[in-house]
């Protein structure tokens, strides 16, 4: 969370940004809020990126002004125009790429004053893991797969029954480069699993952490998975 203050004469406004992460190959959002101003035509929003000449996006007098926009952002950016009056200056970024990572500045000017705040935008790939029972193996095993990760994550297994146990000796993890030569498919196999136990496959890099749980009983298999972004907020 970064809060910036700006001074305009005697007036300053608070601009707040949140460190956020973009999943490459999807739309992303760079979050920025400011003190609301009901006079939409008096609001100017400028997004800048460190090391880039020209603007990422500009919104003023109630509409986009892309005349100064850098070409790497052409056709890819948008503010949430209907939410500007309530203080939302967040930027939508279409088809996030690795190269979009960096330090951005959200600059605001309103009739109340001006202010800005920086935002660290991380880009990578993260996806939900899926765990399945591998019946083909000589002993019953679990296979945890996640289709897209970058940078290369760590993978760890845990179990409800054997809490604190180290499963590195009875698991095998591989990383297969995907066709676009950036992201990788993660596959981890846990051997010698026992029935009536809950196992967790945890995949983590510096951007996100995902966990897949599986409970295998005689009568059913229950699965659950979750994903959380790290260092955001």
């Amino acid at each position: 969370l970064i809060i910036g203050f700006g001074i305009s004469g005697k007036h300053f406004i608070t601009v707040t940004t949140f460190t956020s992460a973009g999943n490459i190959g999807e739309d992303g959002t760079l979050s920025c809020t400011f003190e609301p101003d009901i006079k939409l035509n008096g609001i100017v929003i400028q997004w800048l990126k460190e090391g880039i000449k020209g603007l990422v996006h500009e919104f003023k007098e109630g509409k986009d002004d892309l005349s100064q926009q850098h070409e790497m952002f052409r056709g890819r950016t948008a503010v949430f125009a209907d939410q500007v009056v309530v203080g939302n200056a967040s930027l939508r970024l279409k088809n996030v790429q690795l190269t979009d990572a960096g330090t951005y500045t959200c600059y605001i000017r309103t009739s109340k004053g001006k202010g800005n705040a920086n935002l660290e935008y991380k880009t990578g790939a993260f996806s939900m893991p899926e765990i399945n029972v591998d019946y083909n193996a000589s002993s019953e095993s679990l296979r945890c797969e996640a289709p897209r990760w970058f940078p290369q994550p760590t993978v760890a297994w845990a179990s409800q029954v054997d809490q604190g146990a180290n499963f590195s000796e009875v698991s095998n993890t591989s990383f297969e480069l995907n066709s676009e030569n950036v992201t990788m498919k993660v596959v981890s196999v846990l051997y010698n699993v026992t029935i009536n136990n809950t196992y967790s496959c945890m995949i983590e890099n510096d951007i996100a952490k995902a966990t897949g749980d599986i409970k295998v009983t005689d009568s059913e298999v229950k699965r659950r998975s979750q994903l959380q972004l790290l260092n955001s907020g």
Partner: antibody, heavy 115, light 109 residues
Framework: EVQLVESGGGLIQPGGSLRLSCAAS????????MNWVRQAPGKGLEWVSV???????YYADSVKGRVTISRDNSKNTLYLQMNSLRAEDTAVYYC?????????WGQGTTVTVSS | EIVLTQSPGTLSLSPGERATLSCRAS???????LAWYQQKPGQAPRLLIY???SRATGIPDRFSGSGSGTDFTLTISRLEPEDFAVYYC??????????FGQGTKLEIK
């Protein structure tokens, strides 16, 4: 050369199924937003579906539940699986790459749904 | 869902004249996500303008785009015989959803 080539269209009876293919060359399908857009005879363009680089998919309400967009990264090919076909699905189907907009289009493949 | 309405439905002009095509959105559209396409009979659409005003690769400079918010315009400054075709505007929305206008037919007078 950047190119998209569709195939798989044809005459199909109502209720039938069809799989359209779109082979890409000169770029990687999995790095782009890839779309299917259709055009009924004498009508305008209608967006059907998109698959993001991440694999996330979205569909127009008119086809939701009846079509599935997918891709085979090893073949650099986009697909549209169409089920429960109706007469109103009769159209030329185009695949299109979206970078900053739909900048590359295939030549289209014709689907005719009729008994 | 955002609806794009193009006008006029048909525009009859002569080569050498200026053509102005309008695209109106039912709610505000980001300029970045507004594009124009040209389609000739029996052919696939061709991207002309993206980001409301940026010309796509290989598009002659007689084609220009402008506008923001809910009102966008495609202008062809001096019509050439090969410009007579159907023109579509299109937006990338927040559903996410792509929407096309119904098209404007530009015909020879």
């Amino acid at each position: 050369e950047v190119q998209l080539v569709e195939s798989g269209g044809g005459l199909i009876q109502p209720g039938g199924s069809l799989r359209l293919s779109c082979a890409a060359s000169g770029f990687t399908v999995s790095s782009n937003y890839m779309n299917w857009v259709r055009q009924a005879p004498g009508k305008g363009l209608e967006w059907v579906s998109v698959i993001y680089g991440s694999g996330r998919t979205y569909y127009a309400d008119s086809v939701k539940g009846r079509v599935t967009i997918s891709r085979d990264n090893s073949k650099n090919t986009l697909y549209l699986q169409m089920n429960s076909l109706r007469a109103e699905d009769t159209a030329v189907y185009y695949c299109a790459r979206d970078t900053y907009a739909m900048d590359v289009w295939g030549q289209g493949t014709t689907v005719t749904v009729s008994s | 869902e955002i609806v794009l309405t193009q006008s006029p439905g048909t525009l009859s002009l002569s080569p050498g004249e200026r053509a102005t095509l309008s695209c109106r959105a039912s709610q505000s559209v980001s300029s970045s996500y507004l594009a124009w396409y040209q389609q000739k009979p029996g052919q696939a659409p061709r991207l002309l303008i993206y980001g409301a005003s940026s010309r796509a690769t290989g598009i002659p400079d007689r084609f220009s785009g402008s506008g923001s918010g809910t009102d966008f315009t495609l202008t062809i400054s001096r019509l050439e015989p090969e410009d007579f075709a159907v023109y579509y505007c299109q937006q990338y929305g927040s559903s996410p959803m792509y929407t096309f206008g119904q098209g404007t037919k530009l015909e020879i007078k």
